[in-house]
Interface confidence: low
């Protein structure tokens, strides 16, 4: 059977920022930090001041699906987490303001946010089988699962 998509005409409309200035820690208790201008990585920190603080914005799908769709922005910046392909690092994309409407190829800015207990997963809207993940000695990337770590704890009130 050939690939087929119902996603091409789905439009996502920005609703509001739902979380401010939180830290993401992976299952090894490593925090996400800035590796450079473009990439993120994970490291075990003694001082959480070095960790990246994120804001999370919620979007509503025109398809009215049950998933919580979010954008991730580095707090107090105009940098947004952007998916590439499997095993490729996520990029930090600079935009003048949070997009009001996202559709088509721009869905690489969006993630489905799932929670299971204290575990948080971020699946790429553009690549629904791939998660934001940390990988030893590598950037934060998109991955389908082990050996990459795909579950995160959200640490709030880190302003």
């Amino acid at each position: 059977s050939a690939p087929f998509s119902f996603l091409s005409n789905v439009k996502y409309n920005f609703m509001r920022i739902i979380k401010y200035e939180f830290i993401l820690n992976d299952a090894l208790n490593q925090s996400i930090i800035r590796a450079n201008d473009q990439y993120l990585t994970a490291a075990a920190l003694h001082n959480l001041d070095e960790a990246v603080k994120f804001d999370m914005g919620a979007y509503k799908s025109s398809k009215d699906d049950a998933k919580i769709t979010v954008i991730l922005r580095i707090s107090k910046t105009q940098l947004y987490v952007t998916a590439q392909d499997e095993d490729q690092p996520v990029l930090l994309k600079e935009m003048p303001e949070i997009p009001k409407t996202i559709t088509g190829s721009e869905t690489n800015l969006l993630f489905f946010w799932e929670t299971h207990g204290t575990k948080n997963y971020f699946t790429s809207v553009a690549h629904p089988n791939l998660f934001i993940a940390t990988k030893q000695d590598y950037w934060v990337c998109l991955a389908g699962g082990p050996p990459s770590i795909t579950d995160f704890q959200i640490l709030e009130n880190q302003a």
């Epitope: 087929f4 998509s5 119902f6 996603l7 398809k63 998933k67 489905f112 799932e114 299971h116 089988n129």
Partner: nanobody, 116 residues
Framework: EVQLLESGGGLVQPGGSLRLSCAAS????????MAWVRQAPGKGLEWVSS????????SYADSVKGRFTISRDNSKNTLYLQMNSLRAEDTAVYYC?????????WGQGTLVTVSS
């Protein structure tokens, strides 16, 4: 090789019920969202319902909301669609598909005919 094998279709009277099953193999079922789509005679593909990896999140087309229930058993690598209060307009070939709204594989389909 990815295989999706639907079963459970048949002829049912309006107002009746059917339960479709989809046996999945050739991939790690628990890692993927799954969906049902259908194709009525002479019509295009219509998305029916989706379910996430864990089964915690579901979504339905307006035309089936409140009548159909999607579920999955990850221990059996099986997807289900419980269809109640069936109507003539539900007559279609029902396909199980791998993905939430973008599908790289689907099965051969099972025919559901709603008629008195």
């Amino acid at each position: 090789e990815v295989q999706l094998l639907e079963s459970g279709g048949g002829l049912v009277q309006p107002g009746g019920s059917l339960r479709l099953s989809c046996a999945a193999s050739g991939f790690t079922f628990v890692r993927y969202d799954m969906a049902w789509v259908r194709q009525a005679p002479g019509k295009g593909l219509e998305w029916v319902s989706s379910i996430n990896k864990s089964g915690a999140l579901t979504s339905y087309a307006d035309s089936v909301k409140g009548r159909f229930t999607i579920s999955r058993d990850n221990s059996k690598n099986t997807l289900y669609l419980q269809m109640n209060s069936l109507r003539a307009e539900d007559t279609a070939v029902y396909y199980c598909a791998k993905g939430w709204a973008s599908f790289d594989y689907w099965g051969q389909g099972t025919l559901v005919t709603v008629s008195s």
